[in-house]
Interface confidence: medium
Amino acid sequence: QGWQAFKNDATEIIPELGEYPEPPPELENNKTMNRAENGGRPPHHPFETKDVSEYSCRELHFTRYVTDGQCRSAKPVTELVCSGQCGPARLLPNAIGRGKWWRPSGPDFRCIPDRYRAQRVQLLCPGGAAPRARKVRLVASCKCKRLTRFHNQSELKDFGPEAARPQKGRKPRPRARGAKANQAELENAY
């Protein structure tokens, strides 16, 4: 898939919240359109619109426990996984085999993490060790990002390790499932 690799642990532990700059508020003016739940209005014609906020992401709510070594959070945290395409349906069918047809010069709209939030969690450790408090960075919302067919993985590197899934070594298209997913269960997932 060509995603950047990242450390295979449960989440990114943040020493200090202030170390992470706020992502740019690119779609702040039309955030409600940027959600699959809200069924964002499709454009009049594919790729004629310049307002990416008209495309909505598929935001999957997951819950998981935060782990740090052998320690695990007392309660699960809730975050989003940003997944797949978020533009109009493809204009061309797949080629035979695993390859994809690319629109000759058309953009590819991918769903990637937009805003993050910090949450303090209490980590419980085995062997009677004292509980530890940590701040974790969680995906709070997703957005569409317009990529061209020639964009490579560097296009996703601005969005932190949650923005891309582990390497799979196939298909040249960047995939942005986004946040590392989660465990337990979301009480109000929908």
Partner: antibody, heavy 118, light 107 residues
Framework: QVQLVQSGAEVKKPGSSVKVSCKAS????????LNWVRQAPGQGLEWMGT????????TYSQKFKGRVTITADKSTSTAYMELSSLRSEDTAVYYC???????????WGQGTTVTVSS | DIQMTQSPSSLSASVGDRVTITCSAS??????LNWYQQKPGKAPKLLIY???SLHSGVPSRFSGSGSGTDFTLTISSLQPEDFATYYC?????????FGGGTKVEIK
């Protein structure tokens, strides 16, 4: 090639639990969501829940919440679906299905028939 | 939950016929719609994803269209192996939901 191989048929008593396994091969197990879908005799398809084995994230259909538990064993690339407090209406074929990047279930297990009968 | 309604629930057709199956969502789902084919005693098979993208190995006689709430699966020229039940599925919002199915039978 990608394969999802499920455990064999089960006959269970009402009130008991069943645990169905789904062994994945031919792809990196932790890279994909794995869903569970069931189909009662002569009926349509019903989504139960999904797991992201990369770190065991789960989400379930409200209908089964509290009765279903989906887990994954990364060391054996196997996902499990446990359904408790079985009743006769849980008699169905249970499928596991891999989810690709745009939400499509591109590979399915062969199905496991669970019969709940007293 | 988003309800997915397929029509017709069954249809009879002959080899070579053009067959159209519709799927209606109870609320807008943009293009987050997949189509599956299922034969008796077998697991479903993916045909179309993201409304109109053909899955690998699926013949080009299958096509999908639509957006928002109304979607269509078309088989341009029905073949003997196409007699089966077809399901639509939305994945815009949890829980993922399927249509009730359309059984395509031999006339």
């Amino acid at each position: 090639q990608v394969q999802l191989v499920q455990s064999g048929a089960e006959v269970k008593k009402p009130g008991s639990s069943v645990k169905v396994s789904c062994k994945a091969s031919g792809y990196t197990f932790t890279d994909y969501f794995l869903n569970w879908v069931r189909q009662a005799p002569g009926q349509g398809l019903e989504w139960m829940g999904t797991i992201y084995p990369y770190h065991d994230g789960t989400t379930y259909s409200q209908k089964f919440k509290g009765r279903v538990t989906i887990t994954a064993d990364k060391s054996t690339s196997t996902a499990y679906m446990e359904l408790s407090s079985l009743r006769s209406e849980d008699t169905a074929v249970y499928y596991c299905a891999r989810e690709e990047e745009d939400g499509q279930f591109d590979y399915w297990g062969q199905g496991t028939t669970v019969t709940v009968s007293s | 939950d988003i309800q997915m309604t397929q029509s017709p629930s069954s249809l009879s057709a002959s080899v070579g016929d053009r067959v159209t199956i519709t799927c209606s969502a109870s609320q807008g789902i943009q293009w987050y719609l997949n189509w599956y084919q299922q034969k008796p005693g077998k697991a479903p098979k993916l045909l179309i994803y993201y409304t109109s993208s053909l899955h690998s190995g699926v013949p080009s006689r299958f096509s999908g269209s639509g957006s928002g709430t109304d979607f269509t699966l078309t088989i341009s020229s029905l073949q003997p192996e196409d007699f089966a039940t077809y399901y639509c599925q939305q994945h815009s919002k949890l829980p993922r939901t399927f249509g009730g199915g359309t059984k395509v039978e031999i006339k």
